[in-house]
Structures are given as C-alpha cells and as structure tokens.
C-alpha cells in the first residue's frame, strides 16, 4: 500500500452566515494522525504514535498550515450562492500518495453538505464534477471564486501538491511510520446461534500495519470463503487497526475449529472456549 | 506449564482387558481434544482416534474400531484408553496427544508400554 | 488413507552440519504437514506445523519447507539435542498418517 496524507477540513454555515472555526483532521497511512483543537487552536496529535513521528519538534508548522486551510475554506464557502436557511457543510478533502516505486498522486475533493461536487487532480489540475445539476452549479460557483482568488493560480496547485508531498516525506523520515509492527491481539468468543449452533468470532485488534489474515480452519483445513463473515479492517483510534472474522458451527463441534492469524510474519492459531468453566489444575 | 502425565506400565495376558490413562495438567481439559496413537516396537507412529473432551464422543481410525475404547473423567481432567480382548499384536507404546483444533498433536504425554504375552 | 513415506529411514551427520530430511506424500496434501521430533527416551514434541511454521519454543535452527506432496525439515546447524528421530504427519485427510520416521545419529 503507497503511504499517504490525508487532510479533512470542515466548515458549517448557518442561515447563510458562515461560523467562526472549522474541523480538521489530518491521517497519515490511513490512521488518524492530527486534529486541530478548537478550543486551544492548536493542531494536536492523535496517540503517542503520533507525537513519536516528530518526537520533541513543535506543531506550530501544522497548526500554521491548517489554520490557513480553514480560513480559506471558510471564504470558499461564502462564496456558495446555494445558501438557505439551516445548517450547511462544506468539506474539503485533499490526499497525497507516495507508491512503492515513488511515483506520486495528489488530489482534492469538495464536499457540499457531505455531497461531492467538485474533484480535482492536482498533478494534472484536471477537475471532475458529477454529473446532477445541483454539482454543476456549486462546483461552478467554487471555481468561478477560485479563479477570481489571486492565490488560487496554477503555481499554487503546483504547491499545495508540493506541500503535501513534503509534509508526508517529513512524517516519513523519522522512520517511526515505516518501522513500526505492532502485533494483533486475538480473542476468540462465542455466542449462541439457532438451536444447535453457535457464532464463534475471532477479533485482532491493536495491530500495525493493516495487511492481516485472519481465517477459521476446521480441522486444520481452511473453510471456503462463503461460510465465513468478515468485518473491514478499521482504525481502533489508537493509531492501530482492528478487524474480526466469524462463522456458526454446531455446538459441540468447538474442538474442531481454530481461528488462524498471520500478520507481518507472524502467526498464530486461537482455539474455541467450550463454553464449560474448569478449574485450572497445576502440577506440583 | 502443560503436561499430560500417563499411567505406568502394563504388563498382560492375551484376552485380558487393559486401562490406560492420561492426566492433563495446566490448561482447560474440555476445550481440547486427546488423540490416542501407538507405536510399535522400533516402529513409526499410528494414529488411533481421538475423544472430543466437551461431549464425550469418540472417533477411531478404522484399524481400531471394536476392541478400543476412549472414555473420560471430565472432574478429574483424565482420558482413558481401554482395550479388550489384547492380542500380541497390541504390545506397543501408547501415548495420549493433546489435539489442537484436530489437527495438531502439540503436547504429548510420555508414553504407556503395554506388554502382551501368550 | 494418504501414505506418507520417509525413504530415509535414518541418518548419519556432524554436528555442526546442515541436516535435511525428507517426507513425501501418496497425494497432494496442500502443505496440510506437520513435523515432531521423537527423543531417544521416547519424549515427543511438535516441532513445526503447516509446513514450515515454527513452534512456540522451538529453535530457529529447525525449519521446514514443501509443496504438493514433497515436503522437508531442515536443521541448520546440528546440535547435540538434535539426535533423535523425525516424524511428518498429514493432516489434509482423516485419518491422519505419519511417515515411518528418520533417525539422526551423530557421526
């Protein structure tokens, strides 16, 4: 997977008027990374993994960078004339990609009212609209004001990409993204299911990076994919991911089944709880 | 740490019933299986079945459906292998397996010598 | 029944020596393999299962490797303990089967 930026700016009007601050969130690799408090202004890292990235360095560049991007997406927003009474969204979302033969991709994407109406490639500055009318008018009036914005010219595309690429090669380099392996934790549960059967599930979590497999074997043998249920594999909060597999077996059956992990070289196997409490015995 | 611990020695005579058993130490007795596997002597290693330990219900390889029987004491963490009816083809070492999701023998006990004699 | 035969039946090697011993099934078991290890006392202990992935507890030295019906053990570099005798065992079908075993002396 290429490693990537990504930026999430919010801001909200209401009755037409647009309100003072804005939402941010920046994720680095899929995790999130920085968000910009409200109440201290500050960009402000998400975990001890986060702040590792740039260990004792300040956020002031980061807090600097995204205060500017949420004052010009709330100028941006003025400027829609699809203004009505209510609450109202504009989200702007921009992505930078570095690929394992360092090819690079950037892009930025508009969101009106969590709709997308506007896209752009800022490599090739090419821009892409959906096709409904109500995109064709809201990406016309956005454009028409980043035209009109001096700032908004093709060297400024050129830096935004620029920018972005630069800010994720910094990440980079401290070496804490690229190094880090945090091993799964694996719990296997079971619940009852129909008469006769119960839903065993095994859930990783806590794991870095994402590539994981996680399968149910019976009798040592892997089951077909059909008889199997997945969860995506999903950011746990913690700069870590979390997934779970499960499938229904017939009660009793429990000692036949294993769940088997594999996650950066590593492996394991988790048996099935038979549902009966045991005192441990230990020998002397 | 784990450890399935197995009765001594026996020594018999054709015809004669034996008992054999197998104690497990250190973990969760009903949330594995035990495989039961012979070898013979100076020879490799069969595999004779094994008892899910949460229902009790045993399942042999054909070479040992008849005169062989897997039982269990839940309470006391104990399996049991019984044969009936011993031949001489039945002097062996008999060895209790944990069963791993039921296709792993990854702890063993030390081993059961059975001698049957005419 | 799958037949799994181990055409070596023992071997001789130094320690220090790279050992390899061999295990190939009657048909495709889908890297469905196990290895053991059986000590002169008569001791048994998994050493690797599916193939090549290691034991908790077992020493880098051993690993395994196969596919299809042909499948192997390596020990890197022999040790004393390694003298015993060697056992792979299918687990692609019921019943399970083990080859004949592979003992390992020291020259």
């Known amino acids: 997977e290429p490693h990537s930026l990504r930026y999430n700016l919010t801001v909200l009007s209401w009755d037409g008027s647009v309100q003072s601050g804005f939402l941010a969130e920046v994720h680095l690799d899929g995790q999130p990374f920085l968000r910009y408090d409200r109440q201290k202004c500050r960009a402000k890292p998400q975990g001890q993994w986060a702040e590792d990235v740039l260990g004792n360095k300040t956020w002031d560049r980061e807090t600097r960078d995204l205060t500017g991007n949420g004052k010009d997406l709330r100028m941006t927003l003025a400027h829609i004339k699809d203004q009505k009474e209510g609450l109202h969204s504009l989200q702007e979302i921009r992505v930078c990609e570095i690929h394992e033969d360092n090819s690079t991709r950037s892009s930025q994407h508009f969101y009106y009212d969590g709709e997308l109406f506007l896209s752009q490639n800022l490599e090739t500055e090419e821009w892409t609209v959906p096709q409904s009318s109500r995109a064709q008018t809201l990406a016309m009036n956005v454009r028409n004001f980043l035209k009109e914005d001096a700032m908004k010219t093709k060297t400024h595309y050129h830096a935004m990409h620029a920018d972005c690429l630069q800010e994720l090669r910094r990440y980079l380099e401290s070496g804490v993204v690229l190094r880090r392996t945090v091993p799964p934790m694996v719990n296997v549960t079971r619940s009852e299911a129909s008469e006769g059967n119960i839903t065993v599930t095994c859930r990783a979590s806590s794991f870095y990076p994402r590539n994981i497999i996680l399968t149910w074997r019976q009798d040592g043998v892997s089951l077909s994919h059909d008889t199997q249920q997945w969860g995506d594999v999903l950011p746990d909060g913690n700069g870590t991911y979390q997934t779970w597999v499960a499938t229904r077996i017939c009660r009793g059956e429990e000692q036949r089944f294993t769940c088997y992990m594999e996650h950066s070289g590593n492996h394991s196997t988790h048996p099935v709880p038979s549902g009966k409490v045991l005192v441990l015995q230990s020998h002397w | 740490q784990i450890q399935l611990v197995q009765s001594g020695p026996e020594l018999k005579k054709s015809g004669e019933t034996v008992k054999i058993s197998c104690k497990a130490f250190?973990?969760?007795?009903?949330?594995?299986?035990m495989n039961w596997v012979k070898q013979a002597p100076g020879k490799g290693l069969k595999w004779m079945g094994w008892i899910n330990t949460y229902t009790g219900e045993p399942t042999y390889a054909d070479d040992f459906k008849g005169r062989f029987a897997f039982s269990l004491e839940t309470s006391a963490s104990t399996a049991y292998l019984q044969i009936n009816h011993l031949k001489n083809e039945d002097t062996a070492t008999y060895f209790c397996?944990?069963?791993?999701?039921?296709?792993?023998?990854?702890?063993w006990g030390q081993g059961t010598t059975l001698t049957v004699s005419s | 029944d799958i037949q799994m035969t181990q055409t070596t039946s023992s071997l001789s090697a130094s320690l220090g020596d790279r050992v390899t011993i061999s295990c190939s099934a009657s048909?495709?078991?889908?890297?469905?393999l196990n290895w053991y290890q059986q000590k002169p006392d008569g001791t048994l202990k998994l050493l690797i299962q599916y193939t090549s992935l290691l034991h908790s507890g077992v020493p880098s030295r051993f690993s395994g490797s196969g596919s299809g019906t042909e499948y192997s053990l390596t020990i890197s570099n022999l040790e004393p303990e390694d003298i015993a005798t060697y056992f792979c065992q299918q687990y692609s079908k019921f019943p399970r089967t083990f080859g004949g075993g592979t003992k390992l002396e020291i020259k």
């Open positions: 048909q495709g078991i889908s890297n469905y």
């Open positions: 397996a944990r069963n791993y999701g039921n296709y792993l023998f990854d702890y």
């Open positions: 250190g973990y969760t007795f009903t949330n594995y299986g």
